[in-house]
Amino acid sequence: SQVSQNCHNGSYEISVLMMGNSAFAEPLKNLEDAVNEGLEIVRGRLQNAGLNVTVNATFMYSDGLIHNSGDCRSSTCEGLDLLRKISNAQRMGCVLIGPSCTYSTFQMYLDTELSYPMISAGSFGLSCDYKETLTRLMSPARKLMYFLVNFWKTNDLPFKTYSWSTSYVYKNGTETEDCFWYLNALEASVSYFSHELGFKVVLRQDKEFQDILMDHNRKSNVIIMCGGPEFLYKLKGDRAVAEDIVIILVDLFNDQYFEDNVTAPDYMKNVLVLTLSPGNSLLNSSFSRNLSPTKRDFALAYLNGILLFGHMLKIFLENGENITTPKFAHAFRNLTFEGYDGPVTLDDWGDVDSTMVLLYTSVDTKKYKVLLTYDTHVNKTYPVDMSPTFTWKNSKLPNDITGRGPQ
């Protein structure tokens, strides 16, 4: 049903869904703090632009009685229940900042006539791609896939002279929400990644993964997995690893690798870590001081969602345009706005673009070093360390298939 929006006459409201089921186990209080910090910034920016308007947020909490798994498994109905609550209260803001779970976002998008923009900190799955009024402020699976295909095909770098066309993917079902959808996308037979690879097998058991590490008959030297170093160690332990194995560890939302005093443990020497370029000022900000390196990105996405709304509101008000129109709902894409930690770019489909960073462990210093960066906006790789101190032979990444000559 049509719900009137609190979105006119100089008063603009943001509906923030505070769902018990969330992509990251973050206390809702921290997300509230992030939203409130964002509101302060937006109010200041609008005032500086000479726009004398009111911007507020309404936090919509679910009762948590039915949907209490805490993760995303029971989020589908929770999102719809919250929308029903908004509908019954006849109280909808100009924008919905909310569901981080792929299940809930997909279902909410499907089951509602969205004439308002939806901003998500999460919704990583491919099923949330190409949604006309959905904006995602954390790297979705599609971006990861495009990097991997780009990197697999690269063969003209001093440290990577072979194109790759094969991979194992380790996916055991215990992953975090982001990892679950990243690996899901790699597993999907119809995905771009699967389409571009000649061979891909999903390893679902710990033993399968462990056996591959020294299996002379393995079909690929490359294994993709998702998580942090500790996750890898629990799986791999102190087992020997064949010298031409390359483990790609996807750990996008973790700034820790860039801290000065971090030392890479021995078991990381065969590993390339894919993460995001860290923010500049986040460590000292009031809302993020007590957050873990992963949760910083989640809270930041909420904060940036508020700043994005403020950016769009400012543009529409300055142009004398109506906010409660399909044009506004469809406008949250193909733009760059000033985020909390610098410019944030959204692609044509409203998904955040970022700089991904591939790290390796220096055998000399035991430090994580940047091997290359990848700009998701232009789908381009930029080598950084032209003579890396790799563990691999001749300081070059091996071929993906043992015994195969130059391609």
Epitope: P229, E230, Y233, G237, D238, E259, N261, V262, T263, Y267
Partner: nanobody, 115 residues
């Protein structure tokens, strides 16, 4: 602030035994490996023994069969049982704890083997 405190160093006669202990205070996180290193005057610091949380132990050739390392991850402590001590074992012994992210060193405890 994490601190490692070693104890157990002493003056002992050749053939004697000592047990070194190292305890971490503060929030250290999940431990990957613990170890003992030593540095004799005018020499480089060298590995004595290490143990990982996965159960792998590693000893310097010169101490194999005489020294035993044991770690207690739950209590953030590591021990080094040293038997059949020799004069060449004289050194400052340092404990090292490595989490999955950080490396911590103790201040060292002096072991002197002399008659």
């Amino acid at each position: 602030q994490v601190q490692l405190v070693e104890s157990g160093g002493d003056l002992v006669q050749p053939g004697g035994s000592l047990r070194l202990s190292c305890a971490a205070s503060g929030s250290i996180g999940s431990i990957y490996a613990m170890g003992w290193y030593r540095q004799a005057p005018g020499r480089q610091r060298e590995l004595v023994a290490t143990t990982t949380s996965g159960g792998t132990t590693n000893y310097a050739d010169s101490v194999k069969g005489r020294f035993t390392i044991a770690g207690d991850n739950a209590k953030n402590t590591v021990f080094l049982q040293m038997n059949s001590l020799r004069p060449e074992d004289t050194a400052v012994y340092y404990c090292k704890i490595q989490t999955h992210w950080y490396v911590y060193w103790g201040q060292g405890t002096q072991v002197t083997v002399s008659s």
